[in-house]
């Protein structure tokens, strides 16, 4: 066969679908690899061909589009399963070609089983809600294109295993789930089950996402440096180890980059000749506020080191702060020598 631009196996698009549910999978060529869409390709005389490799097999096979009730079909650049079966798991390839042009990409499709409480190996998207912020919504994801707008599906929402009904702060409103007030107790997995009719059959789409309640921007503050502070003096003798922790609290801010760094005499530690090490640890609160601690360590401090300026800096989208550590050389205790004058008197 003639040469074909092979984009390989696109593992970035690990597609997971539930067993016994409809699935529509767009050929990734037009979304991520080619600069033109399916309509342009089709009108230019290019043909889209689908084939697959079963799980744990090496043999590429054509997809059987003659199954009962058209269980697998192709429509434009979409491969349809109505519904999926467990053994549809495998690597699927879509190839666009004519006599002079060929381009193809493969992608893994995993058909996943779920239990009666919607638990499964499916990777769940995470939706963050601000705590006590007023109305916020989550929307049942990835259901576009499954049924025409003339069809009115029924949508049932669940938190974990329980149907959401008369929940105190959560109101199901069709494809949306409205949180009148988001609380820590709302953390968890939410599932929408969309039921719709098609050609005398009833199909279900199950979509689960994780809700994580995070700090509200109403309560967000610039970084707060807890240490170093004015109450602690780092008093050392030359030769001792100097350890200075810089502990900074960051309010949760969506998409904010939190940074902590030390300067020594106004320079980054990497830019000076002192043998200094910095270890960082990060902890998070229940609402994803962050505490970062960077410990500056000099194994054997010199008297010169004890004269330097050690400043902890912190930055977030809310602002930048800095605090100097109080470092000083321990003054040696005065050494008292007692001289005994012994007089031997001769008589």
């Amino acid at each position: 066969s003639e040469r074909c631009d092979d984009w390989g196996l696109d593992t970035m698009r690990q597609i997971q679908v539930f067993e016994d549910e409809p699935a529509r999978i767009k050929c990734p060529l037009f979304e991520h690899f080619l600069k033109f869409n399916y309509s342009t390709a089709h009108s230019a005389g290019l043909t889209l061909i689908w084939y697959w490799t079963r799980q744990d097999r090496d043999l590429e096979e054509p997809i059987n589009f003659r199954l009962p009730e058209n269980r697998i079909s192709k429509e434009k650049d979409v491969l349809w399963f109505r519904p999926t079966l467990l053994n549809d798991t495998g690597n699927y390839t879509c190839m666009l070609r004519n006599t002079t042009y060929c381009s193809k990409v493969a992608f893994p499709l995993e058909v996943v089983q779920k239990d009666s409480c919607f638990n499964s190996p499916m990777k769940l998207p995470v939706h963050k809600l601000y705590i006590e912020y007023g109305i916020q919504r989550i929307t049942c994801p990835n259901v576009d294109g499954y049924f025409p707008s003339s069809v009115k599906p029924t949508i049932t929402w669940y938190m974990g295993c329980y149907k959401i009904q008369n929940f105190n702060n959560v109101i199901p409103e069709g494809m949306n789930l409205s949180f009148l007030i988001a609380l820590i107790s709302n953390n968890g997995n939410y599932t929408c089950v969309v039921t719709y009719p098609e050609n005398g059959r009833t199909f279900h789409l199950t979509r689960t996402l994780t809700v994580k309640v995070v700090g509200s921007p109403k309560n967000a503050v610039p970084p707060v440096i807890h240490s170093p502070n004015d109450h602690v003096v780092y008093e050392k003798e030359p030769g001792e180890e100097l350890l200075i922790p810089c502990t900074v609290y960051f309010s949760f801010l969506m998409d904010s980059r939190n940074e902590v760094w030390w300067t020594i005499d106004g320079k980054k530690p990497d830019d000076i000749t002192i043998d200094v090490t910095i270890n960082e640890s990060i902890s998070h609160s229940r609402t994803e506020d962050e505490t970062r601690t960077q410990i500056l360590s000099i194994k054997k401090v010199t008297s010169e080191d004890l004269k330097r300026s050690y400043v902890c800096h912190a930055r977030s989208a809310k602002g930048e702060v800095a605090k100097a550590a109080k470092v000083k050389q321990k003054v040696p205790a005065p050494r008292y020598t007692v001289e005994l004058a012994c007089g031997f008197g001769a008589t």
Epitope: E132, Y133, G134, I135, Q165, N166, F167, N168, N169, I171, P172, E173, G174, S178, L180, I181, L183, S185, K218
Partner: antibody, heavy 114, light 110 residues
Framework: AEGGLVKPGGSLELCCKA??????????RCWVRQAPGKGLEWIGC?????????YYANWVNGRFTLSRDIDQSTGCLQLNSLTAADTAMYYC???????????WGQGTLVTVSS | ALVMTQTPSPVSAAVGGTVTINCQAS??????LAWFQQKPGQPPKLLIY???TLASGVPSRFSGSGSGTEFTLTISGLQSDDAATYYC????????????FGGGTEVVVK
């Protein structure tokens, strides 16, 4: 809650305390009014566990304010800039579901008249 | 703002009969509707929530149905004690959270 006679333009605070049982912080504390011989009218709700989150009917237009005190199981409604049209029986109501009020106060009559 | 329209009012039926009260929402409120019963001089009492779920202690002769914009409260096997005014309450959160009562339907038992 103590109602009573108020002059037009005046103010009044109505409070409602749960007694004989503990009202969970996961309840909505809401207020509904009913003008004499008329239907029910929703005023607003406050979430018991957080005084930050309150919802009001559009017609309230900032004249009324809801507040709550968790420890006392008390919810209050501050009425300002009162007019004769505000003459009504004011009920406090509570429920786990927003709008699904299964607990009601006996109501207090507020009369706005000069 | 959400507007709830209730029909008819008043409605009358004999003891043992059936009464149907309709409630129409100006917006799609899905199943977020409650029904209340109010007798003169008393606060309202919750009968049904989520359009069709019976509140605790409410007799099964009360039933609710509907979703979206059209809702119905049915009282079958009418008793004299059912003489009251019935209100629907819609819950809607499009811009802010909004509750709206219908105008009420008086049920007269003959």
């Amino acid at each position: 809650a103590e109602g009573g006679l108020v002059k037009p333009g005046g103010s009044l605070e109505l409070c409602c305390k749960a007694s004989g049982f503990s009202l969970s912080t996961s309840y909505w504390r809401c207020w509904v009014r009913q003008a004499p011989g008329k239907g029910l009218e929703w005023i607003g709700c406050i979430y018991a566990g957080s005084g930050d989150v309150t919802y009001y009917a559009n017609w309230v237009n900032g004249r009324f304010t809801l507040s709550r005190d968790i420890d006392q199981s008390t919810g209050c409604l501050q009425l300002n800039s009162l007019t004769a049209a505000d003459t009504a029986m004011y009920y406090c109501a509570s429920g786990v579901g927003f709008g699904y009020f299964n607990l009601w106060g006996q109501g207090t009559l507020v009369t706005v008249s000069s | 703002a959400l507007v709830m329209t209730q029909t008819p009012s008043p409605v009358s039926a004999a003891v043992g009969g059936t009464v149907t009260i309709n409630c129409q929402a100006s917006e799609d409120i899905y199943s977020n509707l409650a029904w209340f019963q109010q007798k003169p001089g008393q606060p309202p009492k919750l009968l049904i929530y989520d359009a069709s779920t019976l509140a605790s202690g409410v007799p099964s002769r009360f039933s609710g149905s509907g979703s979206g914009t059209e809702f119905t409260l049915t009282i079958s096997g009418l008793q004299s004690d059912d003489a009251a005014t019935y209100y629907c309450l819609g819950v809607y959160t499009h811009i802010s959270a909004d509750n709206a009562f219908g105008g009420g339907t008086e049920v007269v038992v003959k």
